[in-house]
């Protein structure tokens, strides 16, 4: 009946509703049907959220913060539904809401505790800082404070830094890990316990490839089955690192099945893509193609980074000319 939020029953006629920042939620309240229905929703027993009586809304003394954000299920009131539809919740809306419902028979009060969570999709980034390589797991906006865990080759890492900045309504969090000189695979998990939402970032370094000039190279990129769900929207990006910054070679959007290619020598195999294999070919290599190639498969629930190091060496021909 209430699809926009989930709620947990707790004692003393109190329910907990968990909402998501900027989304709509329903604060549930029901009563034994009767005539002469009066409904008042209040916040923290002080601020007027919504009033209904004598057959219509009376919002003259509604607190301004709720203006144009609340409504009742008017066709359902006579059936005992006093639930409040609440638009675009913010973190400032967290707290206890009391619903007073009066009928010709009785007056009852229901309490609803609203908790609001934020979880903007995190990202896993690979950065070079001078001679050091870093993996950074970051989330731009999250609330409450998340749990971040790192694993190296599936073994938890105990020390991990967390750089945190708090804004008015949420946290912004960076968790960097120095992986200089490591060939291990790394995994970062960010969990929002309130929203029961987990995101995982996984980084894998492939063995270095040595190629001759004018040859072509095939670089593999296949999602790990544990994370990958083909019916979930995702994006695949291939990029190349040059002088510390990545330039995008190509990307693929699963929602539209669009492939955008920025490098004419880059090719993707459509059949492989249909089998969720995003390996790519780069033709006619030249010396400047040496570097790191990154495949990024990202959805709302995961980021899978696969990195290849390619060394392009001069062909015998070229060498003899020099």
């Amino acid at each position: 009946i209430f699809p926009l939020a989930f709620f947990i029953y707790v004692p003393m006629n109190e329910q907990i509703v968990i909402g998501r920042l900027d989304e709509d939620i329903i604060l549930p309240s029901s009563f034994e049907r009767g005539s002469e229905v009066v409904i008042h929703w209040k916040y923290q027993d002080s601020y007027k959220v919504h009033s209904y009586y004598k057959g219509s809304d009376h919002l003259e003394s509604q607190d301004p913060r709720y203006a144009n954000r609340t409504s009742l299920f008017y066709n359902e009131i006579q059936n005992g539904n006093a639930s409040l539809f609440f638009r675009r919740v913010s973190l400032l809306d967290e707290g206890i809401y009391t619903c007073y419902v009066g009928t010709a028979i009785q007056v009852i009060t229901n309490k609803v505790v609203l908790k609001v969570g934020v979880f903007l999709t995190p990202v896993m980034k690979y950065e070079k800082r001078n001679t050091n390589s870093f993996l950074i797991c970051s989330v731009l906006s999250v609330y409450p404070r998340p749990i971040i865990t790192w694993k190296m080759d599936n073994t938890p890492i105990s020390e991990n830094n967390m750089e945190e900045t708090g804004s008015l309504d949420s946290f912004s969090i960076n968790s960097p890990l120095n992986i200089t000189g490591s060939n291990s695979s790394y995994e970062c998990t960010i969990e929002n316990s309130l929203l029961k939402q987990t995101w995982t970032g996984r980084w894998t370094m492939k063995d270095g490839l040595h190629k001759m000039q004018s040859e072509h190279v095939s670089l593999s990129c296949q999602p790990v089955n544990d994370y990958f769900s083909p019916n979930q929207d995702f994006k695949v990006t291939w990029s190349r690192m040059k002088s510390g910054t990545f330039s995008v070679l190509a990307y693929y959007l699963s929602s539209s099945q669009n492939t955008i290619i920025n490098e004419s020598r880059f090719s993707w195999n459509k059949e492989l893509i249909n089998q969720s294999d995003f390996s790519m070919n780069l033709m006619d290599l030249n010396l400047s193609d040496s570097g790191e190639y990154l495949c990024n498969i990202s959805s709302d629930e995961y980021t899978l980074l696969t990195i290849h190091t390619v060394h392009v060496e001069p062909s015998q021909e070229t060498a003899s000319h020099n």
Partner: antibody
Framework: QVQLVESGGGVVQPGRSLRLSCAAS????????MHWVRQAPGKGLEWVAV????????NYADSVKGRFTISRDNSKNTLDLQMNSLRAEDTAVYFC?????????????WGQGTLVTVSS | DIQMTQSPSTLSASVGDRVTITCRAS??????LAWYQQKPGKAPKLLIY???SLESGVPSRFSGSGSGTEFTLTISSLQPDDFASYYC?????????FGGGTKVEIK
């Protein structure tokens, strides 16, 4: 059972003040709107004021606006009417009455009334 | 404010009579009307609310009807206990108002 008992009535000179109280019992006081209604000797009923269940909304009859103040203490289950600048025409039996619920504005339970006489 | 005009102001009737009291509002009040009975020296007693809903414990010989501006209270068969004053009251607006009252006395 629901009980409403008014007190504080008496004889007072014009221009003076008086405070009426109503002690409520037998129901959850904080859930209901409360009213004062008066009746001049040999006359009809006149509504005076209402206060919402939570004390946030108050409304008054034009005849008493600016002179009378309705208030409530939900922790003590009491309703008060502070009457200032009293006039001869305020002479009446003052009834405290309980609303149907929080804001319906009609009266299910009544006290027996307390007489206020404004006379010099 | 909304004015409530009640008629008649006095009504003489006998036990067993069918009695009708009318109440007219100066503007539409939908069905937000209550009727009360009051006996001398006593507090009023609610009979009817929302124009036609009978309050719990009130005998079924009392009935209310009407909407908008015209309302009636009917006592189908007057009983000795029914000789009293009757008041209508509108609660459509923030300032509620009563009618002037109708005294039902023994003929």
């Amino acid at each position: 059972q629901v009980q409403l008992v008014e007190s504080g009535g008496g004889v007072v000179q014009p221009g003076r003040s008086l405070r009426l109280s109503c002690a409520a019992s037998g129901f959850t006081f904080s859930n209901y709107g409360m009213h004062w209604v008066r009746q001049a000797p040999g006359k009809g009923l006149e509504w005076v004021a209402v206060i919402w269940y939570d004390g946030t909304n108050k409304n008054y009859a034009d005849s008493v606006k600016g002179r009378f103040t309705i208030s409530r203490d939900n922790s003590k289950n009491t309703l008060d009417l502070q009457m200032n600048s009293l006039r001869a025409e305020d002479t009446a039996v003052y009834f405290c009455a309980r609303d149907r619920n929080t804001a319906m504005d009609y009266f299910v339970y009544w006290g027996q009334g307390t007489l206020v006489t404004v006379s010099s | 404010d909304i004015q409530m005009t009640q008629s008649p102001s006095t009504l003489s009737a006998s036990v067993g009579d069918r009695v009708t009291i009318t109440c007219r509002a100066s503007q539409s009040i939908s069905s937000w009307l209550a009727w009360y009975q009051q006996k001398p020296g006593k507090a009023p007693k609610l009979l009817i609310y929302k124009a036609s809903s009978l309050e719990s414990g009130v005998p079924s010989r009392f009935s209310g009807s009407g909407s908008g501006t015209e309302f009636t209270l009917t006592i189908s068969s007057l009983q000795p206990d029914d000789f009293a004053s009757y008041y209508c009251q509108q609660y459509n607006s923030y300032s509620v108002t009563f009618g002037g009252g109708t005294k039902v006395e023994i003929k």
